[in-house]
Amino acid sequence: GELETSDVVTVVLGQDAKLPCFYRGDSGEQVGQVAWARVDAGEGAQELALLHSKYGLHVSPAYEGRVEQPPPPRNPLDGSVLLRNAVQADEGEYECRVSTFPAGSFQARLRLRVLVPPLPSLNPGPALEEGQGLTLAASCTAEGSPAPSVTWDTEVKGTTSSRSFKHSRSAAVTSEFHLVPSRSMNGQPLTCVVSHPGLLQDQRITHILHVSFLAEASVRGLEDQNLWHIGREGAMLKCLSEGQPPPSYNWTRLDGPLPSGVRVDGDTLGFPPLTTEHSGIYVCHVSNEFSSRDSQVTVDVLDPQEDSGKQVDLVSAS
């Protein structure tokens, strides 16, 4: 006859492990008892349980309440046991010793492997600002047994570096993702992916990138100077910029206070019907926590009468 078992039994921490031991006998052989023991190298054998064909299961005190036989129907040649609620300390070598009649004793060993699934954590790096060099965007750490795999899933261009720390029964892996911050990265997901044999599927933690920046400011509204004439209604200047965090806008006049009747509405400066006193140099001041920008324009309000006179002069001059 021969014993049929597994070389390795793998179980996730906290789950139950079936330790297989099946005697495939020759004609008429019977199993009298099956003894299970833990037999780690360098240590004496520690008895788990004894399965007796007549007297049933006896569990040693150290494993009381943790070792059971499979539920019936049970093949009398099946000496398998169930080890409940596996802990890391259960990892190691086990031996089943089968006493048969009339063939004698047989023994087989298996290794119990207890997987400890990781609980990953993601830590964002320092605030990202456009113009910085290579900067830590995030680090991801996962500890388990065996060592987990930590990778990154993102469309963002960057570099990764990993390091591992071995503990007595587990290993911690930390992976860092570095990048050169640019505004195009804003709002992009950076996902830490942790793989481990104890996980049914990869664990994913996503961090949304925030890159502080402030674009150059410019002012729109003066594209056609001829529109800026006395009496025109609805004239406005709009300050263009963008940033993260979103910027705030402030309007001033370089050569004096803002004329009465001029309305400031965020990025827009609204004018009442234009008069010559609206001529001047206007400054849009854009700022956020990251930076500030200025853009200035000169408004020259035309007097149509003056203009037409000039045109006549020009014509007469020709």
């Epitope: 049929e4 789950q15 139950d16 079936k18 099946f22 495939r24 006998g25 020759d26 004609s27 008429g28 052989e29 019977q30 499979p70 539920p71 019936p72 129907p73 093949n75 009398p76 040649l77 099946d78 169930l82």
Partner: antibody
Framework: QVQLKQSGPGLVQPSQSLSITCTVS????????VHWVRQSPGKGLEWLGV???????DYNAAFISRLSISKDTSKSQVFFKMNSLQADDTAIYYC??????????WGQGTSVTVSS | DIQMTQSPASLSVSVGETVTITCRAS??????LAWYQQKQGNSPQLLVF???NLADGVPSRFSGSGSGTQYSLKINSLQSEDFGTYYC????????FGGGTKLEIK
């Protein structure tokens, strides 16, 4: 070559008994157990019981009061007997050789109709 | 008794395709699971035992996987002879079978 051949009646009167013999070849009943399973359109496949290589038996709790399985190792035969059959026992009855936690060879099946 | 829920109940596929049939146990069965194929008018035939082990003579396009309560049978590159009904069965306590998956040619 492993074979299991079944013999038994096709028609059984209600409340009567069903007896099927499973004759095996290519292996010894002292080394392998034999399971009994039935299949019906209404209930699908149902495990009924097993006789192990050492001669001990286990039965499905739903049939324990009216089922017995025995064997004659020297003749390589396993005997299946079920009492008090009713119409819902109409099914195909199979014997099958035990592999560790599986059935690796099946008989051809015995189609049983329970009807008066 | 432990219940075995098999899905899908039927599927229609073409030769050369890959299919996966799943079986969910109502509690942990510790990989004590077998898969069988049955063709019309024939007895079931063992394909996989102990969740992952191919029975003798079974082509390598068949593979079993799973643990705990979730198990699956995968058939790569289906051949015409693979069509039939597939059953899972557990052996942890009173054995019970899944309801079957009928695999038909599209």
């Amino acid at each position: 070559q492993v074979q299991l051949k079944q013999s038994g009646p096709g028609l059984v009167q209600p409340s009567q008994s069903l007896s099927i013999t499973c004759t095996v070849s290519g292996f010894s009943l002292t080394n392998y157990g034999v399971h009994w399973v039935r299949q019906s359109p209404g209930k699908g496949l149902e495990w009924l019981g097993v006789i192990w290589s050492g001669g001990s038996t286990d039965y499905n709790a739903a049939f324990i009061s009216r089922l017995s399985i025995s064997k004659d190792t020297s003749k390589s035969q396993v005997f299946f007997k079920m009492n008090s059959l009713q119409a819902d026992d109409t099914a195909i009855y199979y014997c099958a050789r035990e592999l560790i936690h599986a059935m690796d060879n099946w008989g051809q099946g015995t189609s049983v109709t329970v009807s008066s | 008794d432990i219940q075995m829920t098999q899905s899908p109940a039927s599927l229609s596929v073409s030769v050369g395709e890959t299919v996966t049939i799943t079986c969910r146990a109502s509690e942990n069965i510790y990989s004590n699971l077998a898969w069988y194929q049955q063709k019309q008018g024939n007895s079931p035939q063992l394909l996989v035992f102990a969740a992952t082990n191919l029975a003798d003579g079974v082509p390598s396009r068949f593979s079993g996987s799973g643990s705990g309560t979730q198990y699956s049978l995968k058939i790569n590159s289906l051949q015409s002879e693979d069509f039939g009904t597939y059953y899972c069965q557990h052996f942890w306590g009173t054995p019970t079978f899944g309801g079957g998956t009928k695999l038909e040619i599209k």
